[in-house]
């Protein structure tokens, strides 16, 4: 099964710093989303070769891209405490394929020592992340495609 390789699995950074998240696939990709998981998941970016990338307004002006959709590095700048969370790559192939996620811990500089990432990375998977509530449609019901997680489309 096709996988999305995502790195790092966890990173701790001080407020105002930057973080790189890399999403790599083995081809057959049509586009890729970076989604922030949580009670109200949301798309952070949508990237497709040859198309102007779309960025959520909360991150506008704070995101850079390098590489191509098959091997994409997303750089988030000027991180804020509220940016703490798990970010997952979602590849659009013939089905939906998910990366293992990157836990980004944004800390006050003086408290960095109290927040550390564990060493065990989560496994990448072609299975969907656990579904969560959302206001948008679920076309996978009674279909041959896997049930994807819920979240909002980019504004």
């Amino acid at each position: 099964a096709q996988e999305v390789q995502q790195s790092p699995h966890c990173t701790t950074v001080p407020v105002g710093a930057s973080v790189n998240i890399t999403c790599s696939t083995s081809g057959g990709l049509r586009g890729i989303y970076l989604r922030q998981l949580g009670p109200q998941p949301q798309d952070i970016i949508y990237y497709e070769d040859g198309v102007v990338p779309t960025t959520d307004r909360r991150f506008r002006g704070r995101i850079d891209f390098s590489g191509s959709q098959d091997n994409l590095t997303i750089t988030m700048h000027r991180l804020q405490l509220s940016d703490t969370g798990t970010y997952t790559c979602q590849a659009i192939t013939e089905v939906n394929v998910y990366g293992s996620g990157t836990l980004v811990l944004v800390t006050e500089e003086q408290s960095q020592g109290w927040h550390r990432c564990s060493d065990a990375p989560p496994r990448a998977s072609a299975l969907p992340a656990p579904p969560t509530g959302s206001a948008l449609p679920d076309p996978q019901t009674a279909s041959a495609l896997p049930d994807p997680p819920a979240a909002s489309a980019l504004p």
Epitope: G50, V51, I92, N96, D138
Partner: nanobody, 115 residues
Framework: AVQLVESGGGLVQPGGSLRLSCAAS????????IGWYRQAPGKQRELVAS???????TYPDSVKGRFIISRDNAKNTVYLEMNSLKLEDTAVYYC?????????WGQGTQVTVSS
């Protein structure tokens, strides 16, 4: 609220053509990967075409070369051009977000291929 309104279905003879439309609202259509699905009586719903925001498309072998999906982001509308229709294309056709964001389906549009 999310709304998906499919139209353009009807009765057509084998070998004929139809053009389906789907008007979407209530979510950011221009950034969504959109799929057309169909469900025949007693069968599972199946994906028949999908299109990315940048226009990349995919089709199953059963419709490849006969169906063409397209989109107009300015009108929040996705289309499905169906040519060389076969008896087995008879179904209710729906459009929706390919990623499955939520739980809403439109009413669909009935396509009947019959001689």
């Amino acid at each position: 609220a999310v709304q998906l309104v499919e139209s353009g279905g009807g009765l057509v003879q084998p070998g004929g053509s139809l053009r389906l439309s789907c008007a979407a609202s209530g979510f950011t259509f221009s950034n969504a990967v959109i799929g057309w699905y169909r469900q025949a009586p007693g069968k599972q719903r199946e994906l028949v075409a999908s299109i990315t925001p940048g226009g990349r498309t995919t089709y199953p072998d059963s419709v490849k070369g006969r169906f063409i999906i397209s989109r107009d982001n300015a009108k929040n509308t996705v289309y499905l051009e169906m040519n060389s229709l076969k008896l087995e294309d008879t179904a209710v056709y729906y459009c929706n977000d390919f990623r499955g964001l939520g739980g809403y389906w439109g009413q669909g549009t009935q396509v009947t291929v019959s001689s």
